[in-house]
Amino acid sequence: GKQMTQNYSKMSAEGNISQPVLMDTNANLCCPPIEFRNLIVIVWEIIIRGQPSCTKAYRKETNETKETNCTDKRITWVSTPDQNSDLQIHPVAITHDGYYRCIMATPDGNFHRGYHLQVLVTPEVTLFQSRNRTAVCKAVAGKPAAQISWIPAGDCAPTEHEYWGNGTVTVESMCHWGDHNASTVTCHVSHLTGNKSLYIKLNSGLRTSGSPALDLL
């Protein structure tokens, strides 16, 4: 899979990092930059909703590692902790949403770096004409929910959201251009994983079944 870059990451006032990461990529989470010779202990705490807190610990003095309540084989040390203290998620799954914190204990105190990991899922976008000068744009199973806008603006029904058990959301927008002379309309889908635009030619006659949309991107 692709290596996830940290383009989206944002540092909060408390020193925690908001870290969006694309599903099916690899994520590397880093500890604070502490010299290895000053270390006593490195601990990764992994808190995922609905699961017992998992800790992965390394004690430098004895070169020992321990794990408590850690069952997910996709979450591992990047290397042996004496070589690299980073945590790797390979590949990222939708269930990896949670809080990941590295604690480094030294004789001078504890140093922390925390990540609020938000797993992103790219929605599948479809656009079709449902009836006379009415189009439906769907962003299926995205995480978080996508936003849909139209060019030109039409007479739109309230946007519908369908929430799936795995945390993804399907967003549907239906609009009508009865009194508008537009021959082509564009559905623009905004999402953290990237934006997508599709356009469709409006038929003024009878209802069509799923006129094909054209991708602008």
Epitope: V41, V43, T55, T62, K66, P107, N110
Partner: antibody, heavy 124, light 107 residues
Framework: EIQLQESGPGLVKPSQSFSLTCSVT?????????WSWIRKFPGNRMEWMGY???????VYNPSLRSRFSITRDTSKNQFFLQLNSVASEDTATYYC?????????????????WGPGTMVTVSS | DVQMTQSPSYLAASPGESVSISCKAG??????LAWYQAKPGKTNKVLIH???TLQSGTPSRFSGSGFGTDFTLTIRSLEPEDFAVYYC?????????FGSGTKLEIK
């Protein structure tokens, strides 16, 4: 039951060095745990000085790092405190104690077994 | 270093009474605080660790509470053997630091 017993010189002259011994019975210090030195000054203020763990690695209080060392003699099941360039401010009761690292190696740094303490007076 | 401020320094009470001793940490130590009892001629004894967990052998009249920076040791219905010096200690991070002690005396 684990027992610890400190022994030392009692009286030391300023600028000299002294060594204290902690003898451990009921447990082999190379089998596990972390073995600390703590001192209590007149007036009751306590200061953790450092520890030696079962593998022989040491961790020292940064405020004292350059003035003392902790070593051990595994054949006698003893560990030692050597304090250099002493001054009257080092007059204290010195304790040895143990703590147990938890499953995560974090936060369980409290002392469940102590020695009775040995008084060291620094005076000319 | 995490500064530990313990109060009061002295406390006088009678057997059967309840008393509380306060310990304040200079920064957030979560629940990582221990309480010790020191008596002449005896080795120091850990009563409570992790803020509120009674160490094996500690009588149930002792209890600990607190989180973050403010902690309290409470002794309910004092027994004659409870008159001693009490210390708090943060076990959240190195260097480990202690409070200055509270001497509990018989009134």
């Amino acid at each position: 039951e684990i027992q610890l017993q400190e022994s030392g010189p009692g009286l030391v002259k300023p600028s000299q060095s002294f060594s204290l011994t902690c003898s451990v019975t009921g447990y082999t210090i190379t089998s596990g745990y972390d073995w600390s030195w703590i001192r209590k000054f007149p007036g009751n203020r306590m200061e953790w000085m450092g520890y030696i763990n079962y593998s022989g690695s040491t961790v020292y209080n940064p405020s004292l790092r350059s003035r003392f060392s902790i070593t051990r003699d595994t054949s006698k099941n003893q560990f030692f405190l050597q304090l250099n360039s002493v001054a009257s401010e080092d007059t204290a009761t010195y304790y040895c104690a143990k703590f147990e690292a938890s499953n995560t190696y974090l936060y369980d740094w409290y002392f469940d077994f102590w020695g009775p303490g040995t008084m060291v007076t620094v005076s000319s | 270093d995490v500064q530990m401020t313990q109060s009061p320094s002295y406390l006088a009470a009678s057997p059967g009474e309840s008393v509380s001793i306060s310990c304040k940490a200079g920064k957030n130590i979560n629940t990582n605080l221990a309480w010790y009892q020191a008596k002449p001629g005896k080795t120091n004894k850990v009563l409570i660790h992790s803020g509120s967990t009674l160490q094996s052998g500690t009588p149930s009249r002792f209890s600990g509470s607190g989180f973050g920076t403010d902690f309290t040791l409470t002794i309910r219905s004092l027994e004659p053997e409870d008159f001693a010096v009490y210390y708090c200690q943060q076990h959240n991070e190195f260097p480990l630091t202690f409070g200055s002690g509270t001497k509990l005396e018989i009134k």
